[in-house]
């Protein structure tokens, strides 16, 4: 902590501009009224202050403002919001888009992946819902950042906002975050015909149900193994060969690079040899022929 | 004192184009959102366009005003909106409203400017 | 876009009562609404924003509540120069609310 000591007359502070830079950090802490600097942040982000002297100017606002910053003060942070942590933006309230486009742009080449996450939830939660004006800031400004909102905040996503998602926006969701989007894709994407259904709603598969993946193979999509191998674990084991071979078509050659991988793997475990046989890959670890398979869950479910 | 004027209505035919302006005088005009508002006769308020007056530059528009209206920042103290395509519905008193740094509060307000459009 | 409904219009009054109008958000907005009062031949004056905060120089007799989808403009000891249409808008910035206000409620007062 920066010790307290008192201004000299000569270094007093009437507005915030370059002259500061040459304040030692003491000085900054003594000198540098909260209240100025709060009224004049946006001047702070054209004075190319060190790190040390801006931790005493967040010190500062942090005094000012110990229950979280107001907006038209978060609005010019600048640089000095790589100083804060997830802690300090989760106190904020932040509705507006200039707000989120002003922070994502400082943010940009460092490494503040949880401050942008806890941002945007904050911006979700101060504007009721992820509306689409937020997603269209999101995808242009931080591509990704939409999958670092946990599946709760996404749920408040609108399904008529959907079709403002691109597919890169959704390279790094995890599966329970798709699972949240799918459905919500899916509804939004209803009236649309096979082909263009399936391009549209490729991206959330990776939350799609079995009865979907199955529904999916009766329609000559010809699934790519990307794709593919984004799918549910669960939703791909219960499919048969011949189900997989429709499904992929073209591509079903694929599963041999893939065959020990996740879920192909697994769902070759499942398969009777003699069905892997019929599709011509050599894909080998199926059920040896003349095995009988008991379904010990359904057992014990039963008794 | 802070003042918001519009200038540019009137009386133009079906199919014209029309610019109006917004003529800031005692007011600060950056890190602002300057908006226009529409009313018909005798109907309610109908937003327009708005634009960021500051960093981002950033433009929003209704979906019904998309192609046809184009807002731009002038001046350092005037903002204007291009209307092309003009037809009776338009007719309306078109406000120049100011909100804040960060959201749609219209604290001050143009007295508006009538354009008819008829043949 | 989001859709902002009001109810109910005309709402009439007499002096010294009291008067609710309600404005309602397709979709969940928080606080993020405002009330304007207007009346003839005058741009809208700006009474309440952030759905509950008294604008300055308004009088303490406009009160606003409400949060999410569901608001209320509340004006208690009516006097006759109340009488003004009065509008909802949700003020958050982006495409979507730039168009955000209610149809409008005419007040009467008796």
């Known amino acids: 902590d920066v010790e307290r000591t008192t201004c000299p007359p000569e270094k007093e502070v009437h507005e915030i501009d370059e002259s500061l830079i040459f304040y030692k950090k003491r000085e900054l802490e003594a000198c540098v009224d909260a209240a100025l600097l709060a009224a004049q942040m946006d001047r702070v982000d054209a004075i190319p202050f060190t790190y040390e002297q801006l931790d005493v100017l967040k010190h500062k606002l942090d005094e000012l403002y110990p229950q979280g910053y107001p907006e038209s003060v978060i609005r010019h942070l600048g640089h000095l919001f790589l100083k804060m942590s997830p802690e300090d933006i989760r106190k904020w309230n932040v509705t507006s888009l200039e707000t989120l486009k002003a922070l994502l742009k400082v943010s940009k080449g460092h490494e503040m992946s949880a401050q942008v996450a806890t941002l945007i939830d904050r911006v979700v939660v101060g504007r009721g819902q992820l509306d689409k004006d937020t997603v269209d800031t999101l995808t242009a400004f931080c591509p990704g950042c939409l999958c670092s909102l946990s599946p709760e905040r996404l749920s408040s996503v609108p399904p008529s906002v959907i079709g403002a998602v691109r597919p890169q926006d959704l390279d790094t969701c995890g599966p329970r975050q798709l699972d949240v989007l799918y459905p919500k894709a899916r509804l939004a994407f209803q009236n649309m015909s096979g082909s263009e259904y399936f391009v549209k709603i490729r991206p959330f598969l990776g939350g799609a149900p079995t009865e979907d993946v199955k529904a999916l193979s009766q329609q000559n999509v010809s699934m790519d193994l990307a794709t593919f191998m984004k799918l549910r674990r669960e939703a791909v084991l219960p499919l048969t060969v011949a189900e997989v071979q429709k499904l992929l078509g073209p591509h079903v050659e694929g599963l041999k690079v893939e065959e020990q991988h996740s879920p192909v793997r697994d769902w070759i475990l499942k398969q009777r040899q003699d069905d892997l046989d019929t599709l011509g890959l050599g894909l080998q670890g199926g059920i040896p022929n003349g095995y009988l398979i008991l379904d010990l869950s359904v057992r014990e479910a039963l008794s | 004192q802070e003042q918001l004027v519009e200038s540019g209505g009137g009386l133009v035919q079906p199919g014209a184009s029309l610019t109006l302006t917004c003529t800031a005088s005692g007011i600060d005009f950056s890190r602002y959102y300057m908006c226009w508002v529409r009313q018909a006769p005798g109907k309610g308020l109908e937003g327009i366009a708005c634009i960021y007056i500051g960093g981002s530059g950033s433009t929003y528009y209704a979906s019904w005003a998309k192609g046809r209206f184009t807002i731009s920042k002038a001046s350092s103290t005037t903002v204007t909106l291009q209307m092309t395509s003009l037809t009776a519905a338009d007719t309306a008193t078109y406000f120049c409203?100011?909100?804040?740094?960060?959201?749609?509060?219209?604290?001050?307000w143009g007295p508006g400017t009538l354009v008819t459009v008829s043949s | 876009d989001v859709v902002m409904t009001q109810t109910p219009s005309p709402v009439s009054a007499a002096v010294g009562g009291t008067v609710t109008i309600k404005c309602q958000a397709s979709?969940?907005?928080?606080?993020?609404l405002a009330w304007y009062q207007q009346k003839p031949g005058q741009p809208p004056r700006l009474l309440i924003y952030?759905?509950?905060n008294l604008e300055s120089g308004v009088p303490s007799r406009f009160k606003g509540s409400g949060s999410g989808t569901e608001f209320t403009l509340t004006i208690s000891d009516l006097e006759c120069d109340d009488a003004a249409t009065y509008y909802c808008?949700?003020?958050?910035?982006?495409?979507?609310?730039?168009?955000?206000f209610g149809g409008g409620t005419e007040v009467v007062v008796r």
């Open positions: 409203a100011r909100g804040t740094n960060l959201n749609y509060i219209f604290r001050l």
């Open positions: 952030s759905a509950s």
């Open positions: 808008q949700c003020i958050w910035d982006g495409n979507s609310y730039v168009n955000a």
């Open positions: 979709q969940s907005i928080n606080n993020g």
